[in-house]
């Protein structure tokens, strides 16, 4: 058992048919000695009486709030939670797998540039008594401060019958160094909370490998005369890092016709505009890279080629 | 060139040549073995690489200030990898996949440290950590860690080279 | 299993440009440098540059720069090596052949004849 | 560039002859080299690469050996379907550059 924070404790427990359970020891937190007694969540049934209750957890049933009193005056809580492991493996049933980049992602983050931002986001089907908290730091032996905020819904789609839930959260490294190459990762640990059950799930990552680009702003088209070319030109998205002759960006180009299976036409450039044939009914898509480092591409940017 | 002491670096063609190792640094790390990557281990890369650190100088403002610094640290960083891939960890069992730009790397990482320090001049040089794994399968692990770490080092790199030949550059 | 297939022969007039095109299958097109060797009647083999199709990232002979330009269509898994301004020595097979290191895979050969 | 000299540029052997050949380079390449075998009309075959390493599907006949500058090819016992010609290559930082080529002719 541990304190998750004040009056809450985590059960740890493994979970097999007739397992035997933990035996747990809760303490009343007053300085009264006699006539103390304890109950469990709103039954008013008394469990024991005296300062400690020793109970044996082995399922949902025997978590809760157990709360002791003396004469009817409330004197301390204590919150249990479970946290099962089945089979040496800790239970992951709050959130759902996400499978990108591969299997057992249960968190997905992003950075827009090299700030020390970043934002990392999960999905659940649970829609009620459901909380999180997030840490994060960088390194872990001996850890840099990074700052979380709180998990919010960020997002709710409809997946069949089900109703999905996304929850996000930003976090910033206290101490960000841009220019540096990162040698320990950030660790992201979210503590998730569903009734009575208790879930961890963490992420360790180099902010160079989350590292996805807005999508290049102000595209444009100028016809070229006498051509069946135009020339596309764009501009670095704003919350990409600077200086840009640092930080540079890559580029690729697509001239995409209506149908799916028409031939595409892609070019690569490190400029911020090319020169290509705009066929009828196209349209001309850009996307961005880190130039000098393999992380995600961009989103597109598109203009049609009318 | 950077010589000790402070003249400037061929800025565009070490600019050119940090773009190269970028793409071979990437072009090298599916090949340099048959392993699934999931079996790479999700622990911290070797500990023994020189990284590009904070207080290096190869920030923008770091750079505009004296970039001697800078030089002489992404200098040592070449010659440590250049080491690596001539030493066993790379040349011996498993071999590399017949198809590996492993060789057009290696070159490469010399030849830019030599444009950084041309012959006759001498900054120091980090020591070489004497790395050698006795199993095939732990060398090959070391292979896409040095890599991974590698890709990091030649990024900053490339970015300092970009930023030196677009702005002080004379 | 791998396989390269270039497109067929093709006759040229000095002066002119020919693009010969090299289809790849039976593997992830864009992880691998593609590399265009030729080889000119009863002569040897002559590099003549590589490209990264993730990034299109090239590198020429400099015997061929500026008469060369290799492309990759990544939709398509295809390399292609456009050679201008042909002259008669330009006659030779062409090849491409995966990787950026040893050649363990080699399309067929591509004759391209330069005559007047 | 780096250049590579071949020797010898032809040679006559027998059925079941121990043949080598040699490469030299002109700089040192570490152990960034191969070997290729052509036959007229066909494309070359990979034989040998990082100088010792048997390719997929290669003989055990073959072999090679060498690091820095000297490098080379031997055919331990020279079978019927290996008369052809025989190119090394350097991978180490481009141009690549090939050998001129060593002919193997029935004696």
């Known amino acids: 058992i541990w304190e998750l924070k004040k009056d809450v404790y985590v059960v740890e427990l493994d979970w097999y048919p007739d397992a035997p359970g933990e035996m747990v020891v809760l303490t009343c937190d007053t300085p009264e000695e006699d006539g103390i007694t304890w109950t469990l969540d709103q039954s008013s049934e008394v469990l024991g009486s005296g300062k400690t209750l020793t109970i044996q957890v082995k399922e949902f049933g025997d978590a809760g709030q157990y709360t002791c009193h003396k004469g009817g005056e409330v004197l301390s809580h204590s919150l249990l939670l479970l946290h099962k492991k089945e089979d040496g493996i800790w239970s992951t049933d709050i959130l759902k797998d996400q499978k990108e980049p591969k299997n057992k992602t249960f968190l997905r983050c992003e950075a827009k540039n090299y700030s020390g931002r970043f934002t990392c986001w999960w999905l659940t089907t649970i829609s009620t008594d459901l909380t999180f908290s997030v840490k994060s730091s960088r390194g872990s032996s001996d850890p840099q401060g990074v700052t979380c905020g709180a998990a919010t819904l960020s997002a709710e789609r409809v997946r069949g019958d089900n109703k999905e839930y996304e929850y996000s959260v930003e976090c910033q490294e206290d101490s960000a160094c841009p220019a540096a190459e990162e040698s320990l990762p950030i660790e992201v640990m979210v503590d998730a909370v569903h009734k009575l059950k208790y879930e961890n799930y963490t992420s360790s990552f180099f902010i160079r490998d989350i590292i996805k680009p807005d999508p290049p702003k102000n595209l444009q088209l100028k016809p070229l005369k006498n051509s069946r070319q135009v020339e596309v030109s764009w501009e670095y998205p704003d919350t990409w890092s600077t200086p840009h002759s640092y930080f540079s960006l890559t580029f690729c180009v697509q001239v995409q016709g209506k149908s799916k299976r028409e031939k595409k036409d892609r070019v690569f450039t490190d400029k911020t505009s090319a020169t290509v044939i705009c066929r009828k009914n196209a349209s001309i898509s850009v996307r961005a890279q880190d130039r000098y480092y393999s992380s995600s591409w961009s989103e597109w940017a598109s203009v049609p080629c009318s | 060139r950077a010589v000790p002491g402070g003249s400037s670096p061929a800025w565009t063609q070490c600019q050119q040549l940090s773009q190269k190792l970028c793409t071979l640094a990437w072009s090298a790390h599916p090949l340099v073995g048959h392993m699934d990557l999931r079996e790479e281990g999700d622990e911290e890369t070797t500990n023994d690489v020189p990284h590009i650190q904070c207080g290096d100088g190869c920030d923008p403002q770091g750079l505009r200030d004296n970039s001697q610094f800078c030089l002489q640290r992404i200098h040592q960083g070449l010659i440590f990898y250049e080491k690596l891939l001539g030493s066993d960890i790379f040349t011996g069992e498993p071999s590399l996949l017949p198809d590996s730009p492993v060789g057009q790397l290696h070159a490469s990482l010399l030849g830019l440290s030599q444009l950084l320090q041309p012959e006759g001049h001498h900054w120091e040089t980090q020591q070489i950590p004497s790395l050698s794994p006795s199993q095939p399968w732990q060398r090959l692990l070391l292979r896409f860690k040095i890599l991974r770490s590698l890709q990091a080092f030649v990024a900053v790199a490339a970015r300092v080279f970009a930023h030196g030949a677009a702005t002080l550059s004379p | 299993q791998v396989q390269l297939v270039q497109s067929g022969a093709e006759v040229k007039k000095p002066g002119a440009s020919v693009k010969v095109s090299c289809k790849a299958s039976g593997y992830i097109f864009i992880t691998y440098w593609m590399t265009w060797v030729r080889q000119a009647p009863g002569q040897g083999l002559e590099w003549m540059g590589q490209?990264?199709?993730?990034?299109?990232?090239?590198d020429y002979n400099e015997k061929f720069e500026g008469r060369v330009t290799m492309t990759t269509d990544t939709s398509t898994s295809t390399a292609y090596m456009e050679l201008r301004s042909l002259r008669s020595d330009d006659t030779a097979v062409y090849y491409c052949?995966?990787?950026?290191?040893?050649?363990?895979?080699w399309g067929q050969g591509t004759l391209v004849t330069v005559s007047s | 560039d780096i250049q590579m000299t071949q020797s010898p540029s032809s040679l006559s052997a027998s059925v079941g002859d121990r043949v080598t050949i040699t490469c030299r380079t002109s700089?040192?390449?570490?152990?960034?080299l191969a070997w290729y075998q052509q036959k007229p009309g066909k494309a070359p075959k990979l034989l040998i690469y990082n100088a010792k390493t048997l390719a997929e599907g290669v003989p055990s006949r073959f072999s090679g050996s060498g690091s820095g500058t000297d490098f080379t090819l031997t055919i331990s016992s020279l079978q019927p379907e290996d008369f052809a010609t025989y190119y090394c290559?350097?991978?180490?930082?481009?141009?690549?550059?090939f050998g001129q080529g060593t002919k193997v002719e029935i004696k």
């Open positions: 290559q350097h991978h180490y930082g481009i141009p690549f550059t």
């Open positions: 490209i990264f199709p993730a990034s299109g990232s090239a």
């Open positions: 052949a995966r990787g950026g290191g040893g050649f363990a895979y």
């Open positions: 700089e040192n390449i570490y152990s960034y």
